[in-house]
Interface confidence: low
Amino acid sequence: CNLSQTHSLNNRRTLMLMAQMRRISPFSCLKDRHDFEFPQEEFDGNQFQKAQAISVLHEMMQQTFNLFSTKNSSAAWDETLLEKFYIELFQQMNDLEACVIQEVGVEETPLMNEDSILAVKKYFQRITLYLMEKKYSPCAWEVVRAEIMRSLSFSTNLQKRLRRKD
């Protein structure tokens, strides 16, 4: 499996779109800052088999897609940018799915490193809870947008390391 240059370009475009989605200054939302405890250890990539790393990356993309495709999200962001964002994420998920199947075979895929995948799920549940508690305010969404940009950067770095291994 080769995470190609095209995939790398998709990553950069995803981050660029996230940056463009910003609607208010993060500095006006400092009081709303929150530590969502990004499971960084799951993205260090050293202790992982390639297939495990790919399944964690896929979960990250899937949960990001879920988060930004809710009704509340549609109301918070520019529709055109969101559409482009979905397309980029969808393309990345397709690439990663193809890789997982190539690396471990269809049968093994669902059972991959459940603990790492759960850590990612729980991270997104913390984000969802925060948005609920903040009643999906513009500042809450801005904090989440910045957080997702940060976590997507970690994903991008892990993918770079995987490409270097190829």
Epitope: L118, K121, K122, F124, Q125
Partner: antibody, heavy 122, light 107 residues
Framework: EVQLVQAGAEVKAPGESLRISCKVS????????ISWVRQIPGKGLEWMVK????????IYNPSFQGHVSISVDKSITTVYLQWSSLQASDTAIYYC???????????????WGQGTLVAVSS | DIQMTQSPSSLSASVGDSVTITCRAS??????FHWYRQKPGKAPELLIY???NLQTGVPSRFTGSGSGTECTLTITSLQPDDFATYYC?????????FGQGTKLDVR
């Protein structure tokens, strides 16, 4: 095999403190939330509080906030429910439960402890 | 809080019968509906999660359906083990809430 094993029944007087335990085994402790659920004898089920054992992040049902507290000891994979001052109305069976989290972040209670009966009477 | 109302509160049936229990939420909970069975003197056990998914090990005579504000649990071909109390639950909003229970007993 996933197991949640709870401590035995407790009989206490009003005003006393109490801590009940739930020892879990058979899975990675820090991967799943744990909740406590109350059942007053002959009545229905009430969700009280949940905790993420990874970082002790808690969410309380406002009806129970301030009256009970939840905690974990990761070293012995045990979750606790504690009262500093019991009331007769705390008489109930208390269940610890494990949350399963689906792909779309729906959580449900897939494993239950056997329950701990707490009787508060003068 | 989201109120969960089960109907009926009690129900009599015979072995081999089919029964349906309904649960209504005071606001939409999407598919965050779950069903549990509690046998006398025992802890509840999960039957159905996310409105219609059968928990591993639960017989296929249990089926769940619905979403939004209403869901149903149907049990076909009742077995002696099925005479118990059934609870619905929502985990869409905090605090999580249960229905008041439906007691199924032998006619």
């Amino acid at each position: 095999e996933v197991q949640l094993v709870q401590a035995g029944a407790e009989v206490k007087a009003p005003g006393e403190s109490l801590r009940i335990s739930c020892k879990v085994s058979g899975y990675t402790f820090t991967s799943y939330w744990i909740s406590w659920v109350r059942q007053i004898p002959g009545k229905g089920l009430e969700w009280m509080v949940k905790i993420d054992p990874r970082d002790s992040y808690t969410i309380y049902n406002p009806s129970f906030q301030g009256h009970v507290s939840i905690s974990v000891d990761k070293s012995i994979t045990t979750v606790y429910l504690q009262w500093s001052s019991l009331q007769a109305s705390d008489t109930a069976i208390y269940y610890c439960v494990r949350h399963y989290l689906t792909q779309s972040l729906v959580d449900y209670f897939d494993h239950w402890g056997q329950g701990t009966l707490v009787a508060v009477s003068s | 809080d989201i109120q969960m109302t089960q109907s009926p509160s009690s129900l009599s049936a015979s072995v081999g019968d089919s029964v349906t229990i309904t649960c209504r939420a005071s606001q939409s909970v999407s598919n965050y509906f779950h069903w549990y069975r509690q046998k006398p003197g025992k802890a509840p056990e999960l039957l159905i999660y996310s409105a219609s998914n059968l928990q591993t090990g639960v017989p296929s005579r249990f089926t769940g359906s619905g979403s939004g504000t209403e869901c149903t649990l149907t049990i076909t071909s009742l077995q002696p083990d099925d005479f118990a109390t059934y609870y619905c639950q929502q985990t869409h909003g905090y605090p999580f809430t249960f229905g008041q229970g439906t007691k199924l007993d032998v006619r």
